[in-house]
Amino acid sequence: VVSHFNDCPDSHTQFCFHGTCRFLVQEDKPACVCHSGYVGARCEHADLLA
């Protein structure tokens, strides 16, 4: 399945704690691209291995 990424809707601007929210168009779901040093589905954890 090919997923296309776009900016998340305004309703989810705060969805990713330490990262950028991306919208999976086909799946109608958010995904987080974490800033360096953070991990987790919502970039909520500091990466202790970084």
Partner: antibody
Framework: DVQLQESGPGLVKPSQSLSLTCTVT???????YAWNWIRLFPGNKLEWM?????????SYNPSLKSRISITRDTSKNQFFLKLNSLTTDDTATYYC??????????WGQGTLVTVSA | DIQMTQTTSSLSASLGDRVTISCRSS??????LNWYQQKPDGTVKLLIY???RSHSGVPSRFSGSGSGTDYSLTISNLEQEDIATYFC?????????FGGGTKLEIK
């Protein structure tokens, strides 16, 4: 494929509460997605009422926040709408629908609720 | 709340016609615009999501376009089974809001 079916009373008196059930088949409501209630008023106005998501979190339309509650029974794969302090303005066709982040791909067939003395 | 306006509440067209239904939002909804079809029996189906993408199983005669605050649904070759009411819906901000519907009838 996922199917949704609304059930509940067709006639409710003003000032009473409305309780509706949505029974979901073909998909577990705890697996993913948001499980919504939407109503269609006479004259064709659609209103999103709120949802309960797969993890049990709820979100409600602020216009209804003081009157609405959405709950679920995971063992029966059902979710519920309770709307308090009904007036004749709550007469509508009530739909349950599966939603994602921004849209509603699957709807029940709807159930007409009339609020009348 | 974001207001969604469908200026045409009813529309009459002939079989085979190309029909366009418009929807306007009170602010930029960044392409988070969906179209639904409600049949006379009350059945509701998603047709188009994210402005222009077809939901699975939707006939290719249905298409969507637009950006910013102005969006449209086009039926390229009207068929009898397309007689329905069509609603737009914005999914950019809570609470989700719908247009007032456009009822399509056959001439």
């Amino acid at each position: 494929d996922v199917q949704l079916q609304e059930s509940g009373p067709g006639l409710v008196k003003p000032s009473q509460s409305l309780s509706l059930t949505c029974t979901v088949t073909g998909y577990s409501i705890t697996s993913d997605y948001a499980w919504n209630w939407i109503r269609l008023f006479p004259g064709n106005k659609l209103e999103w009422m709120g949802f309960i998501n797969y993890s049990g979190n709820t979100s409600y339309n602020p216009s209804l926040k003081s009157r609405i509650s959405i709950t679920r029974d995971t063992s029966k794969n059902q979710f519920f709408l309770k709307l308090n302090s009904l007036t004749t303005d709550d007469t509508a066709t009530y739909y349950c629908a599966r939603g994602g982040l921004s849209r509603f791909p699957y709807w029940g067939q709807g159930t007409l609720v009339t609020v009348s003395a | 709340d974001i207001q969604m306006t469908q200026t045409t509440s009813s529309l009459s067209a002939s079989l085979g016609d190309r029909v366009t239904i418009s929807c306007r939002s009170s602010q930029d909804i960044r392409n988070y615009l969906n179209w639904y079809q409600q049949k006379p029996d009350g059945t509701v189906k998603l047709l188009i999501y994210y402005t222009s993408r077809s939901h699975s199983g939707v006939p290719s005669r249905f298409s969507g376009s637009g950006s910013g605050t102005d969006y449209s649904l086009t039926i390229s070759n009207l068929e009898q089974e397309d007689i329905a009411t069509y609603f737009c819906q914005q999914g950019n901000m809570f609470p989700f809001t719908f247009g007032g519907g456009t009822k399509l009838e056959i001439k």
